[in-house]
């Protein structure tokens, strides 16, 4: 807390300019009017204030706006945003995408801080849903943003916003998140033709159920192994050798390199060795001929 002291004669700030960098902390406190600072916030960013001086400027704004800053000030905070705490940001009402972009720009190149996470949360909650423009903006700054949301939060994403999602935005999503996003993507891309549809839906297939994979296997899609390896284990296991062969097309040869990795390993173990042999890849570990194939999972769940 800076002590209240009178401003020395002739030092009263008429505007926010570079002369203020030579002011001591107490002089800034005494000589800069908070209302003037608020109206000229856009100038602060261009002036090389020290961290200590920025603390004083923040303190002045906090006194002027104890219930939270207005958006006209927030939009021009610049580096002063880095001084804000999540508690400060929770008092704000940010509605403009331009304001959001301006503040994200300040944090660009750094990991998502608690301040940024709070800002985004406030912004999205204020809008009621994660619309396409917002999602475009957020994933441009933070490619992993979508995967940082809980399945509950993702449920508010409208299918129309899915068009903004790039493959790299889904890299760190887990199965529960893809379970939510996949049906939305399916809905969003439903009017596309076969090959175009597959290009768009491919990144979301980690949430696809078995029946959708079976349907894709009938469409000559030639799924690559990287995509296949990210499919849900429970969705892959019921697929027959013939279905996997059709699904992967020429990429089926890649199964050999992945035979010790999941979900390929789990899938191989469930296939008859005779059927695996038809692929001509030398895949081993299938059910020997003459073995009774038992799926007791339902029976065990009921008992």
């Amino acid at each position: 807390e800076v002590e209240k002291t009178a401003c020395p004669s002739g030092k009263k700030a008429r505007e926010i300019d570079e002369s203020l960098i030579f002011y001591k902390k107490w002089e800034l406190e005494a000589c800069v009017d908070a209302a003037l600072l608020a109206t000229q916030m856009d100038r602060v960013n261009a002036i090389p204030f020290t961290y200590e001086q920025l603390d004083v400027l923040k303190h002045k704004l906090d006194e002027l706006y104890p219930q939270g800053y207005p958006e006209s000030v927030i939009q021009h905070l610049g580096y002063l945003f880095l001084k804000m705490s999540p508690e400060d940001i929770r008092k704000w009402n940010v509605t403009s995408l331009e304001t959001l972009k301006a503040l994200l720009e300040v944090n660009k190149g750094h990991e998502m801080s608690p301040q940024v996470a709070t800002l985004i949360d406030r912004f999205v909650k204020g809008r009621g849903q994660l619309d396409k423009d917002t999602l475009d903006t957020l994933t441009a700054f933070y490619p992993g943003y979508l995967c940082s949301l809980s399945p509950e939060e993702l449920s508010s994403v409208p299918p129309s916003s899915i068009w903004a999602v790039r493959p790299q935005d889904l890299d760190t999503c887990d199965p529960r998140q893809l379970d939510v996003l996949y049906p939305k993507a399916r809905l969003a891309f439903q009017n596309m033709n076969g090959s175009e549809y597959f290009v768009k839906i491919q990144s979301f297939l980690g949430g696809a159920p078995t029946e959708d994979l079976k349907a894709l296997s009938q469409q000559n899609v030639s799924m690559d192994l990287a995509t296949f390896m990210k499919l849900r284990t429970d969705a892959v296991l019921p697929l027959t050798v013939a279905e996997v062969q059709k699904l992967l097309g020429p990429h089926v040869e890649g199964l050999k390199a992945e035979e010790r990795h999941r979900p390929v390993r789990d899938w191989i173990l469930r296939q008859r060795q005779d059927d695996l042999d038809t692929l001509g890849l030398g895949l081993q570990g299938g059910i020997p001929n003459g073995y009774l194939v038992l799926d007791l999972s339902m029976q065990e769940a009921l008992s």
Partner: antibody, heavy 119, light 106 residues
Framework: QVQLQESGPGLVKPSQTLSLTCTVS??????????WTWIRQHPGKGLEWIGY???????FYNPSLKSRVTISVDTSKTQFSLKLSSVTAADTAVYYC???????????WGQGTLVTVSS | DIQMTQSPSSLSASVGDRVTITCRAS??????LNWYQQKPGKAPTLLIY???SLQSGVPSRFSGSRSGTDFTLTISSLQPEDFAAYFC????????FGQGTKVEVK
């Protein structure tokens, strides 16, 4: 409710073969959702996966132990077994049998049995 | 084999604290990562599977997340019964465990 119980000698002499059996009760080994697993834990240390077997007889072993390990399954007795040959004092550990669900993880464990290798 | 590097090896905390344990895989393992809790003289129990799914019967204060090859177990508010050792395990290929993290009373 599936339960697992390890059994076998608690003391084995160096160079001999360690043999343990895990009895599965309350469920079937003949289930394509599970791997029947052996894991060990050296005193005061972390966990080490030894290997597992599928009901069809397919086995997977830890590469560092592969030359000495055999895991087998007897579906009629609802048991699976571990044999570890040419043991040394470094094989002294608590040995656990466990069930790995392909959809989740090691969801059922035996209580563990301490095997000491000493002459 | 895939190496799992777990940190810290031990930590001291108080009841009510938020506790975070991390595990890094030496290569991509997709979401094939599980977390276990082990109390002295007992077998481990499964807490989290597939990186972030809560095993049936496990309290919701436990959660898991993934960022690339980095995985995190979080206990939102530590309870007296949570003082134990925690292990991560990858099951993408031949399973391997992290070295473990012992959560002790501060």
């Amino acid at each position: 409710q599936v339960q697992l119980q390890e059994s076998g000698p608690g003391l084995v002499k160096p160079s001999q073969t360690l043999s343990l059996t895990c009895t599965v009760s309350g469920g079937s080994i003949n289930n394509n959702n599970y791997y029947w697993t052996w894991i060990r834990q050296h005193p005061g240390k972390g966990l080490e996966w030894i290997g597992y077997i599928y009901y069809s007889g397919s086995t997977f072993y830890n590469p560092s132990l592969k030359s000495r390990v055999t895991i087998s399954v007897d579906t009629s007795k609802t048991q699976f077994s571990l044999k570890l040959s040419s043991v040394t004092a470094a094989d002294t550990a608590v040995y656990y049998c466990a069930r790995e669900d392909t959809m989740t993880g090691l969801d059922v464990w035996g209580q563990g049995t301490l095997v000491t290798v000493s002459s | 084999d895939i190496q799992m590097t777990q940190s810290p090896s031990s930590l001291s905390a108080s009841v009510g604290d938020r506790v975070t344990i991390t595990c890094r895989a030496s290569q991509s393992i997709n979401n094939y990562l599980n977390w276990y809790q082990q109390k002295p003289g007992k077998a481990p129990t499964l807490l989290i599977y597939a990186a972030s799914s809560l095993q049936s019967g496990v309290p919701s204060r436990f959660s898991g997340s993934r960022s690339g090859t980095d995985f995190t177990l979080t206990i939102s508010s530590l309870q007296p019964e949570d003082f134990a050792a925690y292990f991560c395990q990858q099951t993408y290929s031949n399973p391997t465990f992290g070295q473990g993290t012992k959560v002790e009373v501060k």
